[in-house]
């Protein structure tokens, strides 16, 4: 299975890095400093 961070979730994380957790088959965002939220869209 391809990493969805390189495909359909390429632009999912607004101010952060997309990470695909294989064990959970889920995408999460590692936010840049000062940003938070599911998509790192809140400051």
């Amino acid at each position: 299975k391809k990493n969805p961070c390189n495909a359909e979730f390429q632009n999912f994380c607004i101010h952060g890095e997309c990470k695909y957790i294989e064990h959970l088959e889920a995408v999460t965002c590692k936010c840049q400093q000062e940003y938070f939220g599911e998509r790192c869209g809140e400051k």
């Epitope: 299975k1 952060g16 890095e17 990470k19 957790i21 294989e22 064990h23 959970l24 088959e25 889920a26 999460t28 965002c29 590692k30 936010c31």
Partner: antibody, heavy 125, light 112 residues
Framework: EVQLVESGGGLVKPGGSLRLSCAAS????????MSWVRQAPGKGLEWVST????????YYPESVKGRFTISRDNAKNSLYLQMNSLRAEDTAVYYC??????????????????WGQGTLVTVSS | DIQMTQSPSSLSASVGDRVTITCRAS??????????LNWYQQKPGKAPKLLIY???NLQSGVPSRFSGSGSGTDFTLTISSLQPEDFATYYC??????????FGQGTKLEIK
């Protein structure tokens, strides 16, 4: 209450096959990765296989790769281990284990938080 | 592959003693300040039980006399005051995202 119950162990001849099952209850099975861990008599713990929540990703050590296949049926809350071309060194108690985890700020940390009671597999002629 | 080595392999101690078990990884199991190292207790004929996760977090229901510390390649499990029910075998395990997810060889804690 989280419960994991293994079954399917027994005596099998070298080169033979066996299918282990693990029945899960007390939690949302489809939300957790699962693993098999074994313990040879008088020896330590050895990780055998892991499967992701939906079954898309499977992992094996070199010692069982190509011989063992892990699978799951989320509708039945069940985990399986198909073991082929069995060898004497596969003799062990086989445990199924749940992957507990922390997921925060992009970090994923996991651990085996619940274990079954184990099922004994003996490979001998 | 990451190898995990525990020391000592066996240990004799008395009730009330402070006991330390160490676990060394062949390479770092840290990532950006997080340590991917867990500790388990196993009694004869029983399944292992999680004690400590992420190097220093006490699993729910585990007595506070158990603690974990360390980072990088060197980790420690400490029992501050041994109780009769603590005599068992202890295992460390690395849980980085890269398999194989290896265990240490175990430390058997016996009554002196």
């Amino acid at each position: 209450e989280v419960q994991l119950v293994e079954s399917g162990g027994g005596l099998v001849k070298p080169g033979g096959s066996l299918r282990l099952s693990c029945a899960a209850s007390g939690f949302t099975f489809s939300s957790y990765a699962m693993s098999w861990v074994r313990q040879a008599p008088g020896k330590g713990l050895e990780w055998v296989s892991t499967i992701s929540t939906g079954g898309s990703h499977t992992y094996y050590p070199e010692s069982v790769k190509g011989r063992f296949t892990i699978s799951r049926d989320n509708a039945k809350n069940s985990l399986y281990l198909q073991m082929n071309s069995l060898r004497a060194e596969d003799t062990a108690v086989y445990y199924c284990a749940r992957h507990g985890y922390l997921l925060y700020e992009g970090y994923y940390e996991w651990y085996f938080d619940y274990w079954g009671q184990g099922t004994l597999v003996t490979v001998s002629s | 592959d990451i190898q995990m080595t525990q020391s000592p392999s066996s240990l004799s101690a008395s009730v009330g003693d402070r006991v330390t078990i160490t676990c060394r990884a062949s390479q770092s199991v840290d990532y950006e300040g997080h340590s991917f190292l867990n500790w388990y207790q196993q009694k004869p004929g029983k399944a292992p039980k999680l004690l400590i996760y992420a190097a220093s977090n006490l699993q729910s229901g585990v007595p506070s006399r158990f603690s974990g510390s360390g980072s990088g390649t060197d980790f420690t499990l400490t029992i501050s005051s041994l109780q009769p029910e603590d005599f068992a075998t202890y295992y460390c395990q690395q849980s980085t995202e890269n398999p194989p997810y290896t265990f240490g060889q175990g430390t058997k804690l016996e009554i002196k």
